[in-house]
């Protein structure tokens, strides 16, 4: 008789999830020699321990503490790049500008990027059929709690000038309900962070509007200013040229506005 299984509204655990996490950990520690002390089997055990046999709507930050402790890492606090709804360009940027870091450039972020996972209460099984959706089912699900936890800690670590890349093609360039808007903005530490600099990335080739005047950017500026952090904003009119100029800053075409 097949056992009854809870049906959730979201997609199930990414296939080959254990193998993927383990392989990513091994790859990361090979690429980053300063993390070679990490025991990837212990990392997987700690990751698994955060959600296996637990109700997938009842996950807490504490569940991820053992994993976070194994993933402890030095991050230059003045080289942090946050992003919202424009992950690919942010990652392309840090792949070129190697001294800057998104959360996904850290071990913890790298392990979980683009993956889904959940378990079931009182069984050691991983649920590959469905996992809770943040809106339709519950917010304290394994994936949401993980990203809320590591995003909060990443924002807390930031200092000096913090950069954030925002998607100028979206109706809400700054979205209060995004991870950036709901978690990271509120966990920047005013005693350490001097300025938040937003880079608004334009989508259309002929789009010459000043998106730094967008009402949602003004809302972001207001939130940040109330937290005693300075705010600045730049339009990136040509993201392709922007990346090219990061790669080759001495190129003569890179002195003009991008």
């Amino acid at each position: 008789v097949p056992r009854w299984r809870q049906q959730w509204s979201g997609p199930g655990t990414t296939k080959r999830f254990p193998e993927t996490v383990l392989a990513r950990c091994v790859k990361y520690t090979e690429i980053h020699p300063e993390m070679r002390h990490v025991d990837c089997q212990s990392v997987w055990d700690a990751f698994k321990g955060a959600f296996i046999s637990k109700h997938p709507c009842n996950i807490t930050e504490e569940d991820y503490q053992p994993l976070m402790k194994l993933g402890t890492q030095t991050v230059p606090c003045n080289k942090i790049l946050l992003w919202s709804r424009i992950k690919d360009l942010a990652h392309q940027f840090t792949q070129v500008q190697r001294d800057m870091f998104t959360l996904e450039d850290t071990l913890l972020g790298y392990l979980a990027d683009d993956l889904t996972w959940c378990g079931e209460f009182n069984t050691s099984k991983i649920n590959y059929q469905s996992c809770p959706d943040w809106r339709k089912d519950c917010s304290n699900n394994p994936v949401s709690v993980f990203w809320k936890t590591v995003s909060r800690r990443f924002a807390e670590a930031a200092c000096d000038v913090v950069h954030v890349m925002l998607n100028g093609s979206r109706s809400k360039i700054f979205d209060k309900n995004s991870t950036f808007g709901s978690v990271e903005v509120h966990n920047l530490q005013p005693e350490k962070v001097q300025t938040l600099e937003a880079w608004v990335i334009h989508g259309g080739r002929e789009d010459s509007r000043d998106l730094c005047q967008d009402p949602t950017i003004k809302e972001l500026e207001s939130i940040i200013s109330k937290r005693n952090i300075q705010f600045s904003c730049k339009n990136i009119y040509r993201p392709d040229k922007f990346l090219q100029c990061v790669k080759n800053p001495e190129d003569s075409s890179c002195t003009s506005e991008i």
Epitope: K69, L70, T74, T106
Partner: nanobody, 125 residues
Framework: QVQLVESGGGSVQAGGSLRLSCAAS????????MAWFRQAPGKEREVVAT????????HYADSVKGRFTISRDNAENTVYLQMNNLKPEDTAMYYC??????????????????WGQGTLVTVSS
Amino acid sequence: QVQLVESGGGSVQAGGSLRLSCAASGYTDSDYIMAWFRQAPGKEREVVATIYIGGTYIHYADSVKGRFTISRDNAENTVYLQMNNLKPEDTAMYYCAATKWRPFISTRAAEYNYWGQGTLVTVSS
């Protein structure tokens, strides 16, 4: 209240070795990051090496990689800095520092809440 007491500093010829000790007291768990910083006259305090008391995390400044080794003895509540192949530019006051664990560690002195009084290391050529 965490107290830190350094020892082991002194004068040594270039190429020589020293072992610094940092005895810690006053903390109730192993949830601390411990670090060795140094400050040469007229320069900013800079991190040399960092270790997590409750785990495997270790980090070194590029300038000391392969020459310095940080280690801990949890039973003795002591953190060590073994310094080999010392150079004149390693001359500085060496400080032990501690802060509560966090997953993303900064290399900045301002992040550390607890400090020892320092021990002087002088390397002559």
